[in-house]
């Protein structure tokens, strides 16, 4: 099976930066699994952002904006990164990789 | 609501070259991600390549990858698909599709939310 792990147990961001969290998957082959990336804010509850299949597709939730995140999938390093642009104070939030095996 | 108007379609010779266009106009085109598809005689429809938001990435079916170059110009509200190398076999229309929420290969097509009326490309041997 699977296993996620998170490295980054935080990241501290000036307004209007990049941010770029990343995620790496053993137990499995990154190529072979979807990878799904969620935020939940501070009193809120949690929201699907993004996810990339095993065939590189990307989905994005409706009503996001279409250049506010990106999903991206490194096999060399099993990583999977979601990077955050133009950060701003509502993007304050813990983030959330999840899998999906094929 | 977006429109979607193909363009450069035609007949060309086996080895030849065409570009096709698709130009958007209504909502923000940046906001969509866009894919070309094709449709032979009597066949599906059938994924050709597709370009993301940003156009950093490019994907491409097996059967056109090395020949077809999909690209777009957000300013222009444009999307091409360069088409080398063309074969008898690539004769179909050729319809761009425009989704909000999904980029790659593995999109379905009811994810995609407009589409064009289509271009003829027709390659002769």
């Known amino acids: 099976a699977g296993h996620l792990e998170q490295p980054q147990i935080s990241s501290t961001k000036t307004l209007s930066k990049t941010a770029r969290l990343e995620c790496v998957v053993s137990g499995i082959t990154i190529s072979a699994t979807s990878v799904y990336w969620y935020r939940e804010r501070p009193g809120e509850v949690i929201q699907f952002l993004v996810s990339i299949s095993y065939d590189g597709t990307v989905r994005k939730e409706s009503g996001i904006p279409s250049g506010k995140f990106e999903v991206d999938r490194i096999p060399e390093t099993s990583t999977s990164t979601l990077t955050i642009h133009n950060v701003e104070k509502q993007d304050i939030a813990t983030y959330y990789c999840a899998l999906w095996e094929v | 609501e977006v429109q979607l108007v193909e363009s450069g379609g035609g007949l060309v010779q086996a080895g030849g070259s065409l570009r096709l266009s698709c130009a958007a106009t209504?909502?923000?085109?940046?906001?969509?991600?866009m894919g070309w598809f094709r449709q032979a005689p009597g066949k599906e429809r059938e994924f050709a390549a597709a370009i993301s938001w940003t156009g950093s990435k490019t994907y491409y079916a097996d059967s056109v990858k090395g020949r077809f170059t999909i690209s777009r110009d957000n300013a222009k509200n444009t999307v091409y698909l360069q088409m080398n190398s063309l074969k008898p076999e690539d004769t179909a229309v050729y319809y761009c599709a425009a989704s909000s929420d999904c980029s790659g290969p593995g999109c379905h097509t009811e994810e995609y939310d407009y589409w064009g009326q289509g271009t003829q490309v027709t390659v002769s041997s």
């Open positions: 209504g909502r923000t085109f940046s906001e969509y991600a």
